[in-house]
């Protein structure tokens, strides 16, 4: 059997660190057997069998010029093997971050904090940490660890499915290369890393007969699970074309009627989502959708209770967003039963 421990990585490759002494091991001989060493492609002897170093070649203060293939052979000239030297650095602790687009699953991504220059893999696992009592800071013994399954095709991401929203998790990402391993531990709670995907299907439509109005509607992101206990609230922004500043409102449901649009101008609209109890952070903005108020006369309006925008239709104060409103709502896949009072008034 070979006297050379096989480091993780391709066969026949041995590893060292620049600036350090490197020992190469002749794989096809018995440990301690004296061998001769050559650089592949160079006939001069690098180290003879009388060196006292047995089956090893010692390169003091290796540098990039030492990288390449070496030939070792026994006393009688038999080929002991070929060894390729690759230089690089031991792993450093990877940079790890985790995010959740819903309240049941989360993913963690990582990247090296230093480039090692060597073949590298990552070991990913997690433990669940459960609080013993509501007032207690003590934690029960960790459960797990379980593997955090990695994405195929080498994407630097792993996904934990079926996570518990109220639990804390400890993520372990270990960077491994032939010169060692380095671990980053990260404590995460789903509540703090929750960031929904942006709402989908945003549509902006004119309201016939109302040159200052636009109706925006959207749906929950497809990634948000279909269960009624975790709802989303929304934030909507709009602005006329060429206008630099956004107006912001917090709709109560899955649509909003803008009443202070600029007549005749196309408007950009976008929406963002967040857990309705303010866990985590707002989603990124949806792609912008555009709409232009309709042209036409304004019918006489009947004053109505609970109207969303009661100010007269004058140029909007775009820098003063409407105050936030309560955003509890039924499950998104159900109908939004909020009456559009203004609509009723208009029809009357």
């Amino acid at each position: 059997s070979s006297p050379c421990p096989q480091a993780w990585g391709p066969p026949g490759v041995q590893y060292g660190q620049p600036g350090r002494s490197v020992k190469l091991c002749c794989p096809g001989v018995t440990a301690g057997d004296p061998v001769s060493w050559f650089r592949d492609g160079e006939p001069k002897l690098l180290q003879g069998p009388d060196s006292g170093l047995g089956h090893e070649l010692v390169l003091a203060q290796a540098d990039s010029t030492d990288e390449g293939t070496y030939i070792c052979q026994t006393l009688d000239g038999a080929l002991g093997g070929t060894v390729t030297l690759q230089l690089g650095y031991p792993p450093a602790r990877p940079v790890v971050s985790c995010q959740a687009a819903d309240y049941e699953n989360f993913s963690c991504t990582w990247s090296p904090s230093q480039i090692s220059g060597l073949p590298t893999r990552y070991l990913t696992s997690y433990r669940k940490k459960t609080v013993l009592g509501a007032d207690s800071q003590r934690r029960s013994p960790s459960t797990g660890p379980w593997p955090c399954p990695q994405d195929p095709l080498g994407a630097a991401r792993c996904v934990v499915h079926g996570a518990e929203f109220w639990s804390q998790y400890r993520i372990n990402v270990t960077e491994v290369n032939p010169l060692g391993a380095s671990t980053r531990l990260l404590d995460v709670s789903l509540q703090s890393i929750l960031r929904p995907d942006p709402p989908q299907g945003l549509r902006v439509e004119s309201v016939p007969g109302y040159p200052r109005r636009l109706r925006a509607s959207w749906t929950y992101p497809a990634s948000w699970p279909c269960q009624p206990h975790f709802l989303l609230k929304f934030r909507l922004q709009y602005r006329p074309a060429q206008h630099p500043a956004w107006s912001t409102v917090e709709p109560a449901g899955l649509e909003e009627v803008i009443t202070d649009a600029v007549a005749g101008l196309p408007h950009a609209v976008r929406v963002s989502a967040r857990d309705f109890l303010d866990a985590g952070t707002w989603s990124t903005w949806s792609p912008e959708a555009w709409g232009t108020p309709s042209t036409g006369t304004i019918p006489k309006e009947i004053p109505a209770w609970g109207q969303l925008h009661t100010q007269p239709e004058v140029e909007p104060q775009v820098d003063s967003p409407a105050p936030p409103r309560p955003s509890l709502q039924p499950h998104p896949r159900l109908l939004d039963h909020r009456d559009s009072v203004e609509q009723v008034a208009v029809l009357a």
């Epitope: 001769s36 050559f38 006939p43 001069k44 002897l45 003879g48 052979q73 000239g77 038999a78 080929l79």
Partner: antibody
């Protein structure tokens, strides 16, 4: 014991090719480099090249790069050297020698190649 | 290519004499120098490797020395079976090259 068997002589026509053989026995063929050398009375010994029988990796003397081609047949433990476009300058004794990377430890008896019309 | 110059070209000796053969390299080759003996109508055989390392089966009267550019093959007492041609060979760089040889003949 180590033996390298080479044919005693080859008579060849100018412009033609010849493939010299070297059958090895008495050792593990793929563990050692096989070298080929040329000897003429005035010019002395010249190294043509070597081949690693395990992977057929070769090193050639640039002088012979277009003249000689080294191959091996592991199944019969035989090394070959093909010489092409022969001229009178190629008349010589050709040796195969088992060695390490750069030394010639065991030599065949040599093949006398005579290039003559 | 590295050129090896051997001297003398011919050396006439009688059995029992001590002999020194010289090989000079055109550039420094450290200790990457080897010696071969070729008797009449025979193939060469390796005598000394890496300037001074002995070879199994070779009589101990053969010894080598030198480093850099100047090398010597010595035998402390020539025997009749030692007559023949002696070649030096370098393995410092490709192509591997030989000296032209020193012929050791009977006086």
């Amino acid at each position: 014991q180590v033996q390298l068997q080479q044919p005693g002589a080859e008579l060849v026509r100018p412009g033609s090719s010849v493939k010299l053989s070297c059958k090895a026995s008495g050792y593990t063929f793929t563990n050692y480099w096989m070298h080929w050398l040329k000897q003429r009375p005035v010019q002395g010994l010249e190294w043509i090249g070597n081949i690693g029988p395990s992977d057929s990796k070769t090193h050639y003397n640039q002088k012979f790069k277009d003249k000689a081609t080294l191959t091996v047949d592991k199944s019969s433990s035989t090394a070959y050297m093909q010489l092409n476009s022969l001229t009178s300058e190629d008349s010589a004794v050709y040796y195969c020698a088992r060695g390490d990377y750069v030394l010639f430890t065991y030599w065949g008896q040599g093949t006398l190649v005579t290039v003559s019309a | 290519d590295i050129v090896l110059t051997q001297s003398p070209a011919t050396l006439s000796m009688t059995p029992g004499d001590s002999v020194s053969l010289s090989c000079r390299a055109s550039q420094s080759i450290s200790n990457n120098l080897h010696w071969y003996q070729q008797k009449s109508h025979e193939s060469p055989r390796l005598l000394i490797k890496y300037a001074s390392q002995s070879i199994s089966g070779i009589p101990s009267r053969f010894s080598g020395s030198g480093s850099g550019t100047d090398f010597t093959l010595s035998f402390n007492s020539v025997e009749t079976e030692d007559f023949g041609v002696y070649f030096c060979q370098q393995s410092y760089s490709w192509p591997l090259t030989f000296g032209a040889g020193t012929k050791l003949e009977l006086k």
